[in-house]
Interface confidence: medium
């Protein structure tokens, strides 16, 4: 089940066969980018 919040690495954060580039292309705002990288880096 879910509940965790920290990403082990960029590769682990990619789902639905998406590439990092495709995710970047669909993040629509500064807030979206900030949130994505906040989770990606494990909030450190």
């Amino acid at each position: 089940g879910g509940g965790g919040s920290k990403h082990k690495c960029v590769q682990n954060s990619l789902v639905n066969n998406e590439t990092l580039e495709s995710i970047m292309n669909t993040l629509e705002s500064e807030e979206d980018f900030r949130k994505y990288f906040y989770y990606l880096e494990g909030s450190k």
């Epitope: 879910g2 954060s13 998406e18 995710i23 807030e31 906040y38 990606l40």
Partner: antibody, heavy 121, light 107 residues
Framework: QVQLQQWGAGLLKPSETLSLTCAVY??????HYWTWIRQPPGKGLEWI?????????NYNPSLKSRATISVDTSKNQFSLKLSSVTAADTAVYYC???????????????WGRDTPVTVSS | DIQMTQSPSSLSASVGDRGTVTCRAS??????LNWYQQKPGKAPKLLIY???SLQSGVPSRFSGSGSGTDFTLTISSLQPEDFATYYC?????????FGQGTKVEIK
Amino acid sequence: QVQLQQWGAGLLKPSETLSLTCAVYGGSFSGHYWTWIRQPPGKGLEWIGEINHRGNTNYNPSLKSRATISVDTSKNQFSLKLSSVTAADTAVYYCAREGSLAARLWFFDLWGRDTPVTVSS
Amino acid sequence: DIQMTQSPSSLSASVGDRGTVTCRASQNIRTYLNWYQQKPGKAPKLLIYAASSLQSGVPSRFSGSGSGTDFTLTISSLQPEDFATYYCQQSYGTPYTFGQGTKVEIK
């Protein structure tokens, strides 16, 4: 075990400011976004906005001009202020934790107990 | 905003029946779709995330499927505690939006 405890004024007059606070007990405050969601009587759920421990926020554009979410990391608390309330803001308000397992794969996995707010003259 | 539309709005069923709730997104949200259960006077509870992943502690009779714009929540054999309102929610983009809910009632 992580718990969310929320509180705030339950009865407001039109044009006043709604103020709610949610405290996080027993778990990590960083590493998550913390969210406010509301539910008008007999209706569905509406996402208000969210904040992380750094103070970065996202808001629902439908409320952005009136909603302010803030954080107090020293107390593991976050708060919602909603200005110029009307009867349409009458709802049950929830605070919630957002969990994440992957990019854009986030979900509300822990909720506080409801805080009913009524706006009436 | 991404609009989420659930059907039916209410579902009458008996204990042991199979229950199915559908959710349609107004645009492609891939599998960024979550399902919640809410009982009267209680906060919603996460059941399914990422369209098909079962949240820890949720009984295996609950399952989710779908991708793109069409999603399904299935309860394989309804139990008395399953009679509640179910909401879908997209996490593809802000503002995060919910379906209007499906109330599963005892026939």
